[in-house]
């Protein structure tokens, strides 16, 4: 039960006090007791419950009423059963007893009131009225946890607007209200109560720029909502009528959890005694609700796809046809960004990452816009953000970014368990340098901080700076699987490729050509590739880099070797000893459920079939996956990217609710 106020009683004059239902009020009977009195007894109206604790226990008088010694060991507390119909309608009488004097009486007139701030602290999607209880002041994780949840109102319900809904202090319509969390103030008081008392709704100054509260006046129509708390307003006096009354508020978060904001926001209603005009107002009671701002959550390849994004650029019609066919097979919506909007920037994966935010009453997809800001920079904000599609960005918006700030360098694993630690939403993966140096690249700290602050997908830092482009999607991917952990990790593997080529040579196919059918490309015989010592040295280096990540992933994701599939792939070291794919990088694939769009490797044709394609199919088809090899050579591969780099996917949110986990 929540702590109420302390009431001091005195025999000199009656005391008037307010007692809020659900609180425990302390009664000080000692400090004003007559000097020659040594004990006291208590009588109350039926609506008041008094509890007296003393060590050792008191003796009962023969009349049946108990007396207690007047000493500091006595604790008197009271609660009220119901709200008062009129001011002071409940009474407590303290009788002081002494050996030589008649009893001295002290009177306490109590007004019971109900004042409670309620929100969906049980996370059911409904607001249940709660009396003032301690539990509302703490937010706890886990299936038995409690505490309310706020969404950052980061979508744009008004198509005419260019701003997010949370950037204005208006409520557009009932759709906009659904992005907010309902909070209800319930009051039950005597009719004249608020002539002598006031209620103030407030938020800490340190949190006022993270939240906005709208009051619904007369009904719940959006046009009748007005801002009462927000970035410019940490407190608001409420005009509350006497009697029984409910007042609804709609709360929106304005900021995601981040370095200096753990995501918790406390809204408090304070009851002030304003009866003494000549004196300052005194706080009589406070009730609070703690909200946690819903984190931005990424979705792994194992989540069902809902929408595919791709760019139309000069001469990529065939690529578009292949992606369109794949999306149709996977029953996905397809969004094509036209040439005039992408400004010759085809790298859809690098521009954005689509995740979601979730509260018990609402789930919202949210696009995380990378700070790379090349030709596609307007696409997330102009074409993706919209009604029920949110937007967030981090990092410097002009300059100061590296290639590792592109979101081909941002992936997430499927759900994993590492030892005793569960990651039911998976873990974020991003690439970094091995150690900082004058020319090393790393993901911008603002991005790293944001990802860590979401708490629910604890990030793992991988090593990707060894690559020319430097993205984790150049050496890893995840595909769904029907067994084991429900997925496989795919890793690019020079070792596996050399093994395959050696086997082919041993079988007499050493003259088979890589890059057959590619115009203006030096075709390479298997035997020449195998005998090229420089290329071998380069791939030995690449293998070491990938193996470093392999061990890191096994440790951080709790994987066994049998959870990993090696995809044959060769690399070459280019300028400044940075690696890039020697032939189209097959691990850089588009995963749409069981349908995989894999870069066509143009490997050696043996018995009428590309041996690289055949090998990959033999590895993935037993998992129930369908492999489609997409020709991306001229339009993507020679520009240092592949199918995954050129596409993006919105996926179905997890069925697991983030608040049920324990980070």
């Amino acid at each position: 039960m929540a702590q109420g106020t302390l009431i001091r009683v005195t025999p000199e004059q009656p005391t008037h006090a307010v007692c809020v239902l659900g609180t425990l009020t302390q009664l000080d009977v000692c400090s004003s007791a007559p000097e020659d009195c040594t004990s006291f007894s208590v009588n109350t109206s039926p609506g008041v419950v008094v509890d007296i604790a003393h060590s050792p226990p008191a003796k009962k008088k023969s009349t049946g009423s108990s007396t207690w010694p007047l000493d500091p060991g006595v604790e008197v507390t009271l609660t009220m059963k119901a709200a008062s119909g009129s001011t002071g309608d409940q009474k407590v009488q303290i009788s002081y007893h002494g050996p030589k004097t008649p009893p001295v009486k002290a009177l306490l007139y109590l007004t019971g009131v109900e004042i409670s701030l309620s929100a969906d602290i049980t996370r059911t999607g409904k607001v249940k009225p709660t009396r003032a209880v301690e539990d509302k002041r703490t937010w706890t994780w886990g299936p038995c946890g409690q505490g309310a949840i706020l969404l950052v109102n980061c979508d744009r319900d008004n198509p005419e607007s260019s701003a997010m809904d949370c950037e204005d202090d208006e409520v557009l319509d009932s759709k906009d209200l659904k992005d907010m969390s309902l909070m209800t103030l319930s009051t039950k008081t005597p009719q004249d109560f608020f002539t002598r008392h006031t209620l103030v709704l407030h938020v800490a100054r340190s949190e006022m720029d993270k939240v906005r509260v709208f009051q619904a006046t007369r009904g719940r129509l959006s046009s009748r909502c007005r801002v009462v708390l927000g970035p410019k307003q940490p407190s608001h006096y409420l005009m509350v009528p006497g009697g029984k009354h409910n007042m609804d508020f709609y709360v929106e978060a304005l900021a995601f959890p981040d370095t200096n904001f753990p995501g918790l926001i406390t809204l408090t209603v304070s009851m002030l005694d304003t009866s003494k005009l000549e004196l300052p107002e005194a706080v009589v009671f406070q009730d609070s609700v703690v909200f946690r701002v819903a984190p931005w959550i990424m979705t792994p390849n194992t989540q069902p796809p809902q929408e595919v994004y791709v760019c139309s650029i000069f001469e990529n019609e065939d690529f578009l046809k292949s992606v369109t066919a794949l999306a149709m097979q996977a029953r996905c919506k397809l969004t094509i960004c036209p040439e005039e909007e992408n400004m010759d920037d085809q790298w859809m994966q690098d521009e954005m990452e689509i995740g979601y935010i979730q509260a018990p009453h609402k789930t919202l997809p949210v696009v995380f816009d990378s700070p790379r800001n090349r030709g596609l920079k307007e696409f997330p904000i102009k074409r993706v953000m919209g009604p029920d599609f949110g937007y967030v960005t981090r990092g410097p918006q002009t300059g100061g970014v590296s290639g590792l700030d592109s979101f081909g360098n941002l992936e997430v694993s499927p759900p994993v368990t590492v030892g005793d630690k569960e990651y039911p939403l998976g873990r974020i993966l991003f690439g970094d340098s091995c150690y900082p140096s004058s020319d090393s690249r790393e993901m911008h700290q603002a991005l790293q901080d944001f990802l860590s602050a979401q708490q629910v997908q604890a990030p793992v830092k991988l090593y990707s700076d060894w690559l020319t482009v430097g993205h984790v999607d150049e050496f890893l991917s995840f595909v769904p699987a029907p067994d084991r952990k429900g997925f496989r990790l795919l890793l690019a593997s020079p070792r596996s490729c050399y093994k395959l080529f050696q086997e082919q040579q041993n079988e007499g196919h050493g003259d088979a050509l890589l890059f057959q059918g590619i115009k203006k490309k030096n075709q390479q015989k298997i035997k020449n590739i195998l005998s090229n010592t420089t290329l071998r040295e380069h791939n030995s280096f690449v293998e070491r880099c990938i193996d470093w990540n392999r061990e890191l992933l096994k440790r951080e994701l709790g994987l066994a070797e049998s959870d990993i599939i090696d995809i044959p792939q060769l690399f070459k070291l280019k300028e400044f000893s940075k690696a890039e794919a020697f032939f189209p990088n097959m691990v850089n694939m588009l995963v749409l459920g069981k349908h995989l769009g894999i870069p066509k490797p143009f490997g050696p044709i043996i018995n009428g079939r590309c041996c690289l394609e055949e090998k990959v199919c033999s590895l993935l088809e037993p998992l129930g996956l369908h492999c489609t090899f997409i020709n991306d050579f001229y339009t993507y591969h020679i520009r240092h990217g592949e199918v995954h780099c050129g596409t993006n996917v919105r996926r179905k949110p997890f069925s697991f609710k983030w608040w049920n986990m324990v980070p």
Epitope: R374, S402, G403, S406, S437, S438, D439, R441, T468, V469, G470, K520, K521, N522, Q524, N532, T534, L535, H538, K572, L573, K574, E575, F576, S577, K578, E580, F582, H637, I638, R639, H640
Partner: antibody, heavy 128, light 111 residues
Framework: QVQLVESGGGLVKPGGSLRLSCAAS????????VSWIRQAPGKGLEWVSF????????YYADSVRGRFTISRDNAKNSVYLQMNSLRAEDTAVYYC?????????????????????WGRGTLVTVSS | QSALTQPRSVSGSPGQSVTISCTGT?????????VSWYQQHPGKAPKLIIY???ERPSGVPDRFSGSKSGNTASLTISGLQAEDEADYYC???????????FGGGTKLTVL
């Protein structure tokens, strides 16, 4: 063959800033490694900065690191050198140079380390 | 002071051969086969004449040749001609924090 033209040079006070541009014609600059090289009056060549064709990594000489920033805008077929906190010793003719990033090379061709196409240069004078 | 060391000047008569040396360390010239040579006439931009130690871009006469031994690279110009009179610079990739180094330049005079 790509042609390069530098612009943006001029007189600037110590501590000031300038932004040099290198505009390409005749080919798509996105397929090229681009470097800036400078030459102080009567002195030798000094390599300043490099940006990869994939626009994913950059390198700088110790003498300019932290003060200069190289960037590229493939849509504008241009590369830029933003020079801040300029010093008297930065006075020089600044050349933009490039080398084609040929994907056909089986192993490292070294094209990022040499410059086969040069612009005519733009003069930067840092003086009070 | 330049990171790669070249002679300040060399000279030769028309028809003769001259060799310009470029000495570095085991962290640049000695480590990588990424040595290039540039020719610069007064008031003009430099021109690439040798790359990857000994390769010639198209259009460069075969009178120009490059080689390397240990930490020293060399440019040899045979059958000197009057138009060869210019400044010559060597360059190398380096594993130092400045990844491309130039020599101080050599003035070739054709007598």
């Amino acid at each position: 063959q790509v042609q390069l033209v530098e612009s943006g040079g001029g007189l600037v006070k110590p501590g000031g800033s300038l932004r040099l541009s290198c505009a390409a014609s005749g080919s798509t600059l996105s397929d090229y490694f681009v470097s800036w090289i400078r030459q102080a009056p009567g002195k030798g060549l000094e390599w300043v900065s490099f940006i990869s064709s994939a626009n994913t990594f950059t390198y700088y000489a110790d003498s300019v690191r932290g003060r200069f920033t190289i960037s590229r805008d493939n849509a504008k077929n241009s590369v830029y050198l933003q020079m801040n906190s300029l010093r008297a010793e930065d006075t020089a003719v600044y050349y933009c140079s490039s080398a084609n990033d040929d994907v056909d090379d089986i192993v490292a061709p070294g094209r990022g380390y040499y410059m086969d196409v040069w612009g005519r240069g733009t003069l930067v004078t840092v003086s009070s | 002071q330049s990171a790669l060391t070249q002679p300040r000047s060399v000279s030769g008569s028309p028809g003769q051969s001259v060799t310009i040396s470029c000495t570095g360390t085991s962290g640049d010239v000695g480590r990588y086969n990424h040595v290039s040579w540039y020719q610069q006439h007064p008031g003009k931009a430099p021109k690439l004449i040798i790359y990857n130690v000994y390769e010639r871009p198209s259009g460069v006469p075969d009178r120009f040749s490059g080689s390397k031994s240990g930490n020293t690279a060399s440019l040899t110009i045979s059958g000197l001609q009057a138009e060869d009179e210019a400044d010559y610079y060597c360059s190398s990739h380096s594993r130092s924090s400045t990844p491309v180094l130039f020599g101080g330049g050599t003035k070739l005079t054709v007598l």
